[in-house]
Interface confidence: low
């Protein structure tokens, strides 16, 4: 058969790779490679990773794991996944928050910090996004209010002065 | 407002020991990786010690290995720099720095003011 | 030993502009470096991450006056209009993991002289 040796793997199962000298089984996702195999199509010396460490995919070749990163509160972010053996974890922003990029090119490994929702109702306006950043998200004014420069007014409940075309069910009914 | 403030340094001779400490506010000290970093008179920059934001990796330069010991206690907001058998070579200004840790990226984002370990017979 | 390399030393003139760079060793050719600032007897200084795409982003407080950019293994960062508070020594630095140990590797830093 000549003195060639195949480069492909001939082991049982389609984890093995080539590591040094033999073909040896990867190490699972959550471990890192300690030592390669010391036989042809043999096990990988694989040590699970240390506490803030993470691996998330079988591998055949990395001898480190990757750090977790940590939620900025600063930035007032929190953890929607704490971090796991397999898996890193996942910030983001608690409800009622959403996500400001801190680099124009935002993409989902970007810096980032969580800024307030705006409270629609809190201004007297109708919700029409599930979470608004400017005022001009939001809607017309709620029942009982009219618009007035910027912002939405009580309408009046006296029958004193007239009564705004958006206030007839308040105050229409006493002109 | 961020602030690392670093104490416990001072003149020792070769040989001694001392216990460097840094006390952290103004931010969530738990969430964040810190290292020693020290700078000899009119020199550069010299990485001296890593430690996770749970103690659960630990990393240190070669030329410190085996006598320097790095801690952490979160409840106390302190990290420490335990220096055993020191040497001539080991004088500098010594500055515990705060990784954000949360971008993915390797960033040293707040310095101490340092403090000054001298080593001499 | 992954090795960042610096000029020592780099003038400007009062209003002007300065380049600096900071060349990376091959095994560190792709990777994310930190500008710092350090004045006279004061503590470094965050300015910007620079990854090597080219895309940075500033520390808090640094005027746009910073700015950054990549080609292949160089990392720079230029400063315009350049003011007397600029005059200080500006160390890159890169954090890397190898053989399962973490680190940090500074450049030798280079000394701006405003003039």
């Known amino acids: 058969q000549g003195g060639t040796r195949s480069p492909r793997c001939d082991c049982a199962g389609d984890f093995h790779k080539k590591i040094g000298l033999f073909c040896c089984r990867g190490c699972p996702a959550g471990h890192y490679l300690k030592a390669p195999c010391t036989e042809p199509c043999g096990n990988s010396t694989c040590l699970v990773c240390p506490q803030d460490t993470f691996l998330a995919w079988e591998n055949h070749h990395n001898s480190e794991c990757a750090r977790c990163q940590a939620c900025d509160e600063q930035a007032s972010q929190v953890a929607l996944e704490n971090c796991s053996a397999v898996a890193d974890t996942r910030c983001g922003c608690k409800p009622g928050w959403f996500v400001e990029c801190q680099v124009s090119q935002c993409v989902s490994s970007s810096p980032f910090y969580c800024q307030p929702c705006l409270d629609c109702g809190a201004l007297h306006r109708h919700t029409r996004l599930l979470c608004s950043r400017r005022d001009t998200d939001c809607g017309t004014c709620l029942p009982g209010f009219y618009e007035h420069g910027d912002g939405c007014v009580s309408c009046p409940t006296s029958t004193l002065g007239s009564c705004p075309e958006r206030c007839a069910a308040v105050c229409g009914w006493r002109q | 407002e961020v602030q690392l403030v670093e104490s416990g340094g001072g003149l020792s001779q070769p040989g001694n020991s001392l216990q460097l400490s840094c006390e952290a506010s103004?931010?969530?000290?738990?969430?964040?990786?810190l290292n020693w970093v020290r700078q000899a008179p009119g020199k550069g920059l010299e990485w001296v010690a890593y430690?996770?934001?749970?103690?659960?990796?630990?990393s240190y330069a070669d030329a410190v290995r085996g006598r320097f010991t790095i801690s952490r206690d979160n409840a106390k907001n302190s990290l420490f720099l335990q220096m055993n058998n020191l040497k001539s070579e080991d004088t500098a200004m010594y500055y515990c720095?705060?990784?954000?840790?949360?971008?993915?990226?390797?960033?040293?984002?707040?310095w101490g003011q340092g403090t000054q370990v001298t080593v001499s017979s | 030993q992954p090795v960042l390399t610096q000029s020592p030393s780099a003038s400007a003139s009062l209003s002007g502009s300065v380049k600096l760079t900071c060349t990376l060793s091959s095994e560190l050719s792709g990777f994310t470096i930190v500008w710092y600032q350090q004045r006279p007897d004061k503590a470094p200084k965050y300015v910007m991450y620079?990854?090597?795409?080219?895309?940075?982003s500033k520390g808090d407080g640094i005027p746009d006056r910073f700015s950054g950019s990549s080609s292949g293994a160089h990392r720079y960062l230029s400063i315009s209009n350049v003011q007397s508070e600029d005059d200080a020594t500006y160390f890159c630095g890169a954090g890397y993991t190898l053989a399962n140990q973490y680190g940090w590797v500074f450049g030798s830093g280079t000394k701006v002289t405003v003039l």
């Open positions: 720095a705060r990784d954000p840790a949360y971008t993915g990226l390797y960033a040293l984002d707040f």
């Open positions: 103004g931010f969530t000290f738990s969430n964040h990786d």
């Open positions: 430690i996770s934001s749970a103690s659960g990796l630990i």
């Open positions: 620079l990854k090597s795409d080219g895309s940075h």
